[in-house]
Interface confidence: low
Amino acid sequence: EEELQIIQPDKSVSVAAGESAILHCTITSLFPVGPIQWFRGAGPARVLIYNQRQGPFPRVTTVSETTKRENMDFSISISNITPADAGTYYCIKFRKGSPDTEFKSGAGTELSVRAKPS
């Protein structure tokens, strides 16, 4: 089986306040089995943004059709962006377990928030 890679192609994304931000993430293998999660920030203080196994996450929608069995696109859209949403977002693959354990992280995408156009 191909070794899993997590590709976050955008190093940074800039979005105007009030708009939606699309954060891209694709994976290259279905294995190991386990959910994808998105976090803002790293380390103990990181904030969970999206978890494939939990929810709902009212401001977050998946960009692709995640019901496709071989889906490898876990890009997300975050609506109604505010300055508080600024930060680096990591797409992380977890390995199934009790509990699920972190397997591999993408390189991160930095989200900056511009002032709302007047």
């Epitope: 019901t67 496709k68 069995r69």
Partner: antibody, heavy 121, light 110 residues
Framework: DVQLVESGGAVVRPGESLRLSCKAS????????MSWVRQAPGEGLEWVSG????????YYADSVKGRFTISRDNSESTLYLQMNSLRAEDTAVYYC??????????????WGLGTLVTVSS | ALTQPASVSANLGGTVKITCSGG??????????YGWYQQKSPGSAPVILI????KRPSDIPSRFSGSTSGSTTTLTITGVQAEDEAVYFC??????????FGAGTTLTVL
């Protein structure tokens, strides 16, 4: 409320064809993969075929590959199963099922009431 | 194929556990997620009780719970009710075979 209503079940002879339909409502049809699951009399559940929501990628159980064709009409929110070269062992209640949004680890969160297909000479 | 007992029984108000094993494994030691379905009578529409091993839909009573260890998953019903008498199917997704189900376990409430 999510509703899945199957139709098209009938009594047919071996070798004949049949087309099942499933009318869906209560959810955005294009956002979800759909499948057919069958249950032979007194038996368990058997997944038959599935189709993804937007790009029509299809999947089949080995037992029906080459004989059955799954398709969907997103404009009509309708799922189809074209069954050719029917055999006695295809006799079953056929359920139309909606896939959940749990990526490729698929679970079926809504089921229709089923339609009975009987293949007998 | 998934393996589960053909039948189990439980006292009204008691606890019953139904096991299911045989989901696929991969070279890295990971395994498939399981779900559980309830069918009240033959030919009636099954209802999903548990998905992702242990997640319960919001409309399913909390007496139903799921847990998984290795390639064995367990459905636990705590405080069994008369209306829980039904056939319970475990299910999973195999990347080569598509969705697969166990043969079903009939629960009798005494």
């Amino acid at each position: 409320d999510v509703q899945l209503v199957e139709s098209g079940g009938a009594v047919v002879r071996p070798g004949e064809s049949l087309r099942l339909s499933c009318k869906a409502s209560g959810f955005t049809f294009t956002n979800f993969a759909m499948s057919w699951v069958r249950q032979a009399p007194g038996e368990g559940l058997e997944w038959v075929s599935g189709i993804s929501g937007s790009d029509d990628t299809t999947y089949y159980a080995d037992s029906v590959k080459g004989r059955f064709t799954i398709s969907r009409d997103n404009s009509e929110s309708t799922l189809y199963l074209q069954m050719n070269s029917l055999r006695a062992e295809d006799t079953a209640v056929y359920y139309c099922v909606k896939d959940s949004t749990v990526s490729w680890n698929t679970f079926f969160d809504y089921w229709g009431l089923g339609t009975l297909v009987t293949v007998s000479s | 194929a998934l393996t589960q007992p053909a039948s189990v029984s439980a006292n009204l108000g008691g606890t019953v556990k139904i096991t299911c094993s045989g989901g696929y494994g991969s070279d890295d030691g990971s395994s498939s997620y399981y779900g559980w379905y309830q069918q009240k009578s033959p030919g009636s529409a099954p209802v999903i009780l548990i998905y992702w091993d242990d997640k319960r839909p919001s409309d399913i009573p909390s007496r139903f719970s799921g847990s998984t260890s290795g390639s064995t998953t367990t459905l636990t019903i705590t405080g069994v009710q008369a209306e829980d008498e039904a056939v319970y199917f475990c299910g999973t997704y195999d990347t080569s075979s598509g969705a697969i189900f166990g043969a079903g376990t009939t629960l009798t409430v005494l």
